[in-house]
Interface confidence: medium
C-alpha cells in the first residue's frame, strides 16, 4: 500500500503547534484512505531542507533565497506548489525586483558607479541581494567585504541594518542606518521615500511599492524602471523591465520520489476546506500564535508547479546569477567589451558532430552543449547552460514565452543585400502522392499523416491550427487513423507510423528517421498519405538532389499538394496552393546576450556561410546533406531583424494568434512552465 | 450544470477487455475526487477506482486491483477505466461519479456516500 502520508516540516514551537492542527482537522475533509498529514519539527529552514532530502520529511514552504539553497547538490529539492497573493481571478505567485529612478535623471543601469542608492535593507531580496548581486561584477576589487565593496561604488547609500561605524557611506543618506520603520527611510516605502526625497538618485524595491506609494498616475509618469539591457521603461512597465522575477513563498520537495501529486492533491484540499474566507475552526493562512507559521498570512490559496519547471527555472536565470554571484563570488562575464565564447546547442548526435566542427573551425568563437529535445535546449539557454540556437517559428514562440529573443533570422533566398533583408517567410504546404487522386483538404479524416515535429510551424501548428477551427476539438489523433509526428505521446496513433527504434521512436530529434522536413517528406514518400512541410522539401529530395537510397529516384512530378478550398496543385503552384505563410526559423537567445550572438555569429557567417564554395574540404554552416542540422540547409545568410526583435514582432500578429488559439491542444511542458512565471 | 456522460459498456466473454470513458462538462475539471462505481443486479452500490483528477492518487477496490486501471485525459476532461481479465461476477452497471463541493469525509474515497454528482450508468455484461 503507497504511503499517503505527506511529513509536513515545521521550523518552530508554534508551527509545530499549528501543524498539528492542519493533521486534524484534514482527517475531516480527506478520505481515510487519502492524504493524511505528520508534522515533523526541526530547529531550522535548512534542517528541514536536509530532512527532506534525507527521506526524514517531505514538504516546507520556504521563501526564494531558500528555494535556492534547497536546489543546490545535495539536497536537490523542487518547487511543487506556489502560494499566491491577490485574487483568484489574478492570482500574484511573483513579485518583481526593479530599480525605480526619477525620469529627468538621464543615466541607465550600467552606470551607477558614483550614483546614490536607496536600500529597502542590508541582506534583503529586493532591496539589496538582487541588485548587489547582479552588480557584483562591477564592484571595485576587493569585493570583499561586500558592504565596502558596494560603499566604495556608490557616493552615498542607505542600507538599513549596516554597520554605520564600519561602512559609513552606507548610512550617509539615512543617519544611523536603523533598522526598524524609526528609521523614515526602512522597508519597501522608505527606500522609496529617499528616492522621492531627492536623497538618492536610484531605490531598489518592488514593482508594487511605487503603486502603494503614489496613487496618482500623474505622480508615477515622475518616475522610472532602469532595465537590464541599459534602457529605461515606464513603471507599469515592469514585467518587461526589471532586475529578477522573485516567487513569493514556494513548497519544495525532493525532485526523486518527492510525492509532489499527494501534496498538491493534500494542499488543494486544504485550501478549498480552509483556505481565505472557508472555515471559523481552522485557517490554514492564519497564525493566532505568530506570524506566517507554515504558509504566508498574507497568501490567498496555492497554484501547482507545472512539473517541468525546476527550481533554476522557477527561480528564473536573473535571480540565480544575483544570488550565484553573491554567495560564490564569482563572476561569469566577461568585460562588456569582449564576448565570451557563445555556446551553442545541439540537438542530439547528429547536430553535436557538427556543432563540434563549427567549434573547431571557429577557434573558441563557438562551444556546443548537448540536449535531447528543442524544448531541453530552450530550458538551457534559459537558464545559462547554453546561449543560442536556430529554431522553427513554432519553438520561437515557446522560447519568447519563456523571455528568449530572436535575434537573426535564416534567409533562404538569394539576394544582394541578403544579411540586411529578412524575409518574408517560407509557405507551409500539404502534400500528397499524385496516385492518391481522390485525396483533398476535406477529406483528411481517417488517413495517415506525416508531420515534422509537434509544435512546429509547417509540420504542426498551421497544419492541425486549421484542422482545429474545423473541428473544434484537439484530438488529432482521433482525427487521422495513424501518423508520425514527432513529440507526441508514446502510445499515440501519432507515433504509430514512425521509424526510430526502442527508445528513439517518435522522438522529436534527428534519432527519429521520419524528424523534421525530411524525414516527414520520407514518412510520405514510405507510408503515408498526407506530410506536412515547407515549399521547398519536396524538390530539395527529387530528382537526384538527396543521394540517400529512399529519395534517390523520386520524382517531383508524382507529387501534388493539397489546397485550402478542395482543389489540388502541382508542386511548384505553392505560392497559390499552400496552408499559410511561415515566418523563417530564426536564431534565439537571452537578452544579456542578444549583442554578442549577433557579432560573432555575423563573423561565423562571413567565415563558413554561403560564400564557402567547396563543402566536401571545407566547413560549411549552412549544409548537413538535406538534414538541416544547427540551420536549415537552404539557409543562404542569418539576417538582421530591425525592429522585429521580440518575438510577438518577429513572428507577426496572425501567427502568434494562431498559435495561441492551439494553446488549448498544447502538450508543452515547457510552454506550461513558463505561462506559470508569465500567464 | 456540471454533466457526466458514460460510455463504453457492452457483452463481453470472460477474461475479455473493455474501456469505459466518462466525458465531464460544465465545471472545471481538476482537483475533485471522481471515479467509478458499479451495481450488479440485486446488490448495493460498490466502490470501484477512483483517482483525484489533475494528476493526484488513485484509489482500487480490493477485487479489481491488478485488472482494472483508471486514468484521465485532461486536456478532453475525461476519466477511463480500463478492464482487462473480466469476470462474470463484473457484470453490473457501471456509474461515473464526481464529489464536487465540500461534503465532509469520514469515509474511504471508494464511499458512494461522499460523491453527489452521476452519470446515467452503462452497462457491463461479462458472459460467454
Known amino acids: 500500500v503507497p504511503d499517503k502520508t505527506v511529513r509536513w516540516c515545521a521550523v518552530s514551537e508554534h508551527e509545530a503547534t499549528k501543524c498539528q492542527s492542519f493533521r486534524d482537522h484534514m482527517k475531516s475533509v480527506i478520505p481515510s484512505d487519502g492524504p493524511s498529514v505528520a508534522c515533523v519539527k526541526k530547529a531550522s529552514y535548512l534542517d528541514c531542507i536536509r530532512a527532506i532530502a534525507a527521506n526524514e520529511a517531505d514538504a516546507v514552504t520556504l521563501d526564494a533565497g531558500l528555494v535556492y539553497d534547497a536546489y543546490l547538490a545535495p539536497n536537490n529539492l523542487k518547487p511543487v506548489v506556489a502560494e499566491f497573493y491577490g485574487s483568484k481571478e489574478d492570482p500574484q505567485t511573483f513579485y518583481y525586483a526593479v530599480a525605480v529612478v526619477k525620469k529627468d535623471s538621464g543615466f541607465q543601469m550600467n552606470q551607477l558607479r558614483g550614483k546614490k542608492s536607496c536600500h529597502t535593507g542590508l541582506g534583503r531580496s529586493a532591496g539589496w541581494n538582487i541588485p548587489i548581486g547582479l552588480l557584483y561584477c562591477d564592484l571595485p576589487e576587493p569585493r570583499k567585504p561586500l558592504e565596502k565593496a558596494v560603499a566604495n561604488f556608490f557616493s552615498g547609500s542607505c542600507a538599513p541594518c549596516a554597520d554605520g561605524t564600519d561602512f559609513p557611506q552606507l548610512c550617509q543618506l539615512c543617519p544611523g542606518c536603523g533598522c526598524s520603520t524609526l528609521n523614515q527611510y526602512f522597508g519597501y516605502s522608505g527606500a522609496f521615500k529617499c528616492l522621492k526625497d531627492g536623497a538618492g538618485d536610484v531605490a531598489f524595491v518592488k514593482h508594487s511599492t511605487i503603486f502603494e506609494n503614489l496613487a496618482n498616475k500623474a505622480d508615477r509618469d515622475q518616475y522610472e524602471l532602469l532595465c537590464l539591457d541599459n534602457t529605461r521603461k515606464p513603471v507599469d512597465e515592469y514585467k518587461d523591465c526589471h532586475l529578477a522575477q522573485v516567487p513569493s513563498h514556494t513548497v519544495v520537495a525532493r525532485s526523486m520520489g518527492g510525492k509532489e501529486d499527494l501534496i498538491w492533491e493534500l494542499l488543494n484540499q486544504a485550501q478549498e476546506h480552509f483556505g481565505k474566507d472557508k472555515s471559523k475552526e481552522f485557517q490554514l493562512f492564519s497564525s493566532p500564535h505568530g506570524k506566517d507559521l507554515l504558509f504566508k498570512d498574507s497568501a490567498h490559496g496555492f497554484l501547482k508547479v507545472p512539473p517541468r519547471m525546476d527550481a533554476k527555472m522557477y527561480l528564473g536565470y536573473e535571480y540565480v546569477t544575483a544570488i550565484r554571484n553573491l554567495r560564490e563570488g564569482t563572476c561569469p562575464e566577461a568585460p562588456t567589451d569582449e564576448c565570451k565564447p557563445v555556446k551553442w546547442c545541439a540537438l542530439s548526435h547528429h547536430e553535436r558532430l557538427k556543432c563540434d566542427e563549427w567549434s573547431v573551425n571557429s577557434v573558441g568563437k563557438i562551444e556546443c552543449v548537448s540536449a535531447e529535445t528543442t524544448e531541453d535546449c530552450i530550458a538551457k539557454i534559459m537558464n545559462g547552460e547554453a546561449d543560442a540556437m536556430s529554431l522553427d517559428g513554432g519553438f520561437v514562440y515557446i522560447a519568447g514565452k519563456c523571455g528568449l529573443v530572436p535575434v537573426l533570422a535564416e534567409n533562404y533566398n538569394k539576394s544582394d543585400n541578403c544579411e540586411d533583408t529578412p524575409e518574408a517567410g517560407y509557405f507551409a504546404i500539404a502534400v500528397v502522392k499524385k496516385s492518391a487522386s481522390d485525396l483533398t483538404w476535406d477529406n483528411l479524416k481517417g488517413k495517415k499523416s506525416c508531420h515534422t515535429a509537434v509544435g512546429r510551424t509547417a509540420g504542426w501548428n498551421i497544419p492541425m491550427g486549421l484542422l482545429y477551427n474545423k473541428i473544434n476539438h484537439c484530438r488529432f489523433d482521433e482525427f487521422f487513423s495513424e501518423g508520425c509526428a514527432p513529440g507526441s505521446k508514446k502510445d499515440s496513433s501519432l507515433c504509430k507510423l514512425c521509424m526510430g527504434s526502442g527508445l528513439n521512436l517518435c522522438e522529436p530529434n534527428n534519432k527519429e528517421g521520419y524528424y523534421g522536413y525530411t524525414g516527414a517528406f520520407r514518412c510520405l514518400v514510405e507510408k503515408g498519405d498526407v506530410a506536412f512541410v515547407k515549399h521547398q522539401t519536396v524538390p530539395q529530395n527529387t530528382g537526384g538532389k538527396n543521394p540517400d537510397p529512399w529519395a534517390k529516384n523520386l520524382n517531383e512530378k508524382d507529387y501534388e499538394l493539397l489546397c485550402l478550398d478542395g482543389t489540388r496543385k502541382p508542386v511548384e503552384e505553392y505560392a497559390n496552393c499552400h496552408l499559410a505563410r511561415a515566418p523563417n526559423h530564426a536564431v534565439v537567445t537571452r537578452k544579456d546576450k542578444e549583442a554578442c550572438v549577433h557579432k560573432i555569429l555575423r563573423q561565423q557567417q562571413h567565415l563558413f556561410g554561403s560564400n564557402v564554395t567547396d563543402c566536401s574540404g571545407n566547413f560549411c554552416l549552412f549544409r548537413s546533406e538535406t538534414k538541416d542540422l544547427l540551420f536549415r540547409d537552404d539557409t543562404v545568410c542569418l539576417a538582421k531583424l530591425h525592429d522585429r526583435n521580440t518575438y510577438e514582432k518577429y513572428l507577426g500578429e496572425e501567427y502568434v494568434k494562431a498559435v495561441g488559439n492551439l494553446r488549448k491542444c498544447s502538450t508543452s511542458s515547457l510552454l506550461e512552465a513558463c505561462t506559470f512565471r508569465r500567464p | 450544470e456540471v454533466q457526466l456522460v458514460e460510455s463504453g459498456g457492452g457483452l463481453v466473454q470472460p477474461g475479455g477487455s473493455l474501456r469505459l470513458s466518462c466525458a465531464a462538462s460544465g465545471h472545471a475539471y481538476g482537483g475533485n475526487y471522481m471515479g467509478w462505481f458499479r451495481q450488479a443486479p440485486g446488490k448495493g452500490l460498490e466502490g470501484v477506482a477512483v483517482?483525484?483528477?489533475?494528476?493526484?492518487?488513485?484509489y482500487y477496490a480490493d477485487s479489481v486491483k491488478g485488472r482494472f486501471t483508471i486514468s484521465e485525459d485532461n486536456s478532453k476532461n475525461t476519466l477511463y477505466l480500463q478492464m482487462n481479465s473480466l469476470r462474470a461476477e463484473d457484470t453490473a452497471v457501471y456509474y461515473c461519479?464526481?464529489?464536487?463541493?465540500?461534503?465532509?469525509?469520514?469515509?474511504?474515497?471508494?464511499?458512494?456516500?461522499?460523491?453527489?454528482?452521476w452519470g446515467q450508468g452503462t452497462l457491463v455484461t461479462v458472459s460467454s
Open positions: 461519479a464526481l464529489a464536487l463541493g465540500s461534503a465532509r469525509w469520514y469515509t474511504s474515497s471508494l464511499d458512494a456516500r461522499a460523491y453527489n454528482i
Open positions: 483517482l483525484y483528477t489533475g494528476g493526484g492518487s488513485t
